[in-house]
């Protein structure tokens, strides 16, 4: 998740104009730059799988790609939790796992990913466009939620699922503490860099690049550290509200994954591609800083006709309280 900026090694400043204050102004931007680059923006991915042998059986897998510690995961369907969605499972890394029908088995797969088997049969089964959402509460990033569903065209007859549309809801106000400091630092850094454009550049060691190079690197796409495409408070409108399902036995057999990472992969991928890695491929790089969106590369994918934007009615502290996040 983290990339390190190659910070130019600064020569001691020349006496005179720069002086002690000048030295501080030169070192500070690089310290802040390193912090900004290494901080990384958390990402949430969701994969929804429908079993071929049991069309009413779904497996939802969710993961959190961030440096913070996860304090709670909530899996819901029918939309985000607290916005019309119904909680299927709550997973706390230390307090335990709780689930309610039709969820059959919720579990931690790793320290940052979970899976949930959802089962039913007959008319009470969830239909293909049911929305499943995973909300990760973490410190210090706050709460991040991704939602996804199997597209209606994902029948077992298809060899590859359609390219998924990404969805992410971020409780930006919940990003406190360290994130706030970093945000301030990054803004201050940009301010300093802008001011430095109008000054003569400091003397650098010849083997290093100019100050502009690390700045460009910091905002360039990379596999190791890409900020998430954040569509705040987004969910899918679905006309199909799942009914309570009867518990059924799990079935093996082939399956089709619809994966909903926080980054869009703008090319169709077959089941083999999804099976090879739990972390989906990532596309354009988008940074979000307190609701301001900057982008390098391509435009973010449009939300499409099935998406609506709305504020979280419960506010940034929605994940706190008796669920163990205090």
């Amino acid at each position: 998740m983290r990339t390190e900026a190659q910070v130019p090694a600064l020569q001691p400043p020349e006496p005179g104009l720069e002086g002690a204050m000048g030295h501080r102004t030169l070192v500070l931007p690089w310290v802040l730059l390193t912090l900004c680059v290494t901080a990384g923006t958390p990402e949430v991915w969701v994969q929804v799988r429908m079993e071929a042998t049991e069309l009413s059986s779904f497996t939802i897998r969710c993961g959190f790609l961030g440096s913070g510690s996860i304090s709670l995961v909530t899996v819901s369907w029918g939309g985000p939790n607290g916005a019309g969605g119904t909680t299927l499972a709550v997973l706390h890394p230390e307090r335990g796992i709780r689930q309610w029908a039709p969820a059959r088995q919720a579990r931690w797969e790793t320290q940052s990913s979970i899976s949930l088997i959802l089962e039913g049969s007959g008319a009470s089964s969830p239909c293909a466009n049911t929305t499943f959402c995973c909300k990760f509460a973490s410190f210090p990033e706050g709460s991040w939620e991704a939602c996804g569903s199997l597209p209606p065209s994902s029948d077992p007859g298809l060899s590859a699922p359609p390219t998924p549309a990404p969805i992410l809801r971020a409780d930006l106000a919940g990003i406190l503490g360290v994130s706030g400091v970093l945000l301030f630092g990054c803004v201050y850094l940009l301010h300093l860099l802008r001011r430095h454009k109008h000054r003569p550049a400091p003397r650098l060691q010849p083997s290093r690049t100019s100050p502009q190079a690390p700045r460009a690197r910091a905002w360039a796409p990379s596999q190791a550290s890409q900020a998430a495409l954040h569509v705040p408070y987004a969910t899918i409108n679905t006309s199909c509200r799942p009914a309570t399902l009867d518990t059924a036995h799990p079935h093996g057999g082939p399956s089709w994954w619809a994966s909903l990472p926080t980054h869009a992969a703008h090319r169709p991928q077959g089941p083999a591609a999804w099976a090879s890695t739990p972390i989906p491929a990532r596309g354009s790089f988008v940074s979000v800083e307190n609701g301001l969106y900057a982008q390098a590369g391509e435009r973010p994918p449009h939300t499409g006709p099935g998406l609506t934007l709305f504020p979280d009615p419960r506010g940034p502290r929605a994940m706190e309280g008796p669920l163990g996040v205090r």
């Epitope: 909680t87 307090r95 419960r314 008796p322 669920l323």
Partner: antibody, heavy 114, light 113 residues
Framework: EVQLQQSGPEVVKPGASVKISCKAS????????INWVKQSHGKSLEWIGD????????NYNQKFKGKATLTVDKSSGTAFMGLRSLTSEDSAVYYC???????WGQGTSLTVSS | DIVMTQSPSSLSVSAGEKVTMSCKSS????????????LAWYQQKPGQPPKLLIY???TRESGVPDRFTGSGSGTDFTLTISSVQAEDLAVYYC?????????FGGGTRLEIK
């Protein structure tokens, strides 16, 4: 801070039914998933079940299936536990607690006596 | 169901002494996915509801004095009170938080001499 306020003590006759309540306050009730726990006099604790306020979904300890019924009224922020066909074995203090048992109600004493 | 067995059933110590109590589960409470043990400890004082002390086998609930320490993994767990105070007079319960039904141990009654 979350507070769980339970209904008062009950004295009922054998064979009767009773419904005890647990009112949550201090936060959004839709975040509350309530557990119910039984403690017979001088004995240990037994988990009865839990309820999901989003849709009234429940999990029960097999031992209490048919004995306890858990319900919720989202509008008033109150969870209920009904107990039927009461016998002296059901005489106990019943507690409600939040999802991970980090907050508890004060307990409701139930005495079944003829 | 997972059976939780606590020992001793009661113990009497003087204020300032160190005390340990044991809890054994019939099945492992270790979650293989994240390597966490789903075991909780509660303190119940006379006439009061239980109070959560420890979760995840070793994490103290906020506000719990640091003289309370939980340890152990898998099926064997221990609650240690490093220096018993008069207000620690209570019954201590361990609980399986791993799988439903969430069973409790029989309790260890702590008395102060």
């Amino acid at each position: 801070e979350v507070q769980l306020q339970q209904s008062g003590p009950e004295v009922v006759k054998p064979g009767a039914s009773v419904k005890i309540s647990c009112k949550a306050s201090g936060n959004t009730f839709t975040d509350y998933f309530i557990n119910w726990v039984k403690q017979s006099h001088g004995k240990s604790l037994e988990w009865i079940g839990d309820i999901n306020p989003d849709n009234g979904g429940t999990n029960y300890n097999q031992k209490f299936k048919g004995k306890a019924t858990l319900t919720v009224d989202k509008s008033s922020g109150t969870a209920f536990m009904g107990l039927r066909s009461l016998t002296s074995e059901d005489s106990a203090v019943y507690y409600c607690a939040t999802l991970y048992f980090d907050y508890w109600g004060q307990g409701t004493s139930l005495t079944v006596s003829s | 169901d997972i059976v939780m067995t606590q020992s001793p059933s009661s113990l009497s110590v003087s204020a300032g002494e160190k005390v340990t109590m044991s809890c054994k589960s019939s099945q492992s409470l270790l979650n293989s996915g994240n390597q966490k043990n789903y075991l909780a400890w509660y303190q119940q004082k006379p006439g009061q509801p239980p109070k959560l002390l420890i979760y995840g086998a070793s994490t103290r609930e906020s506000g719990v004095p640091d003289r309370f320490t939980g340890s152990g993994s898998g099926t064997d767990f221990t609650l240690t009170i490093s220096s018993v105070q008069a207000e620690d007079l209570a019954v201590y319960y361990c609980q399986n938080a791993h799988s439903s039904p969430y069973t409790f141990g029989g309790g260890t009654r702590l008395e102060i001499k």
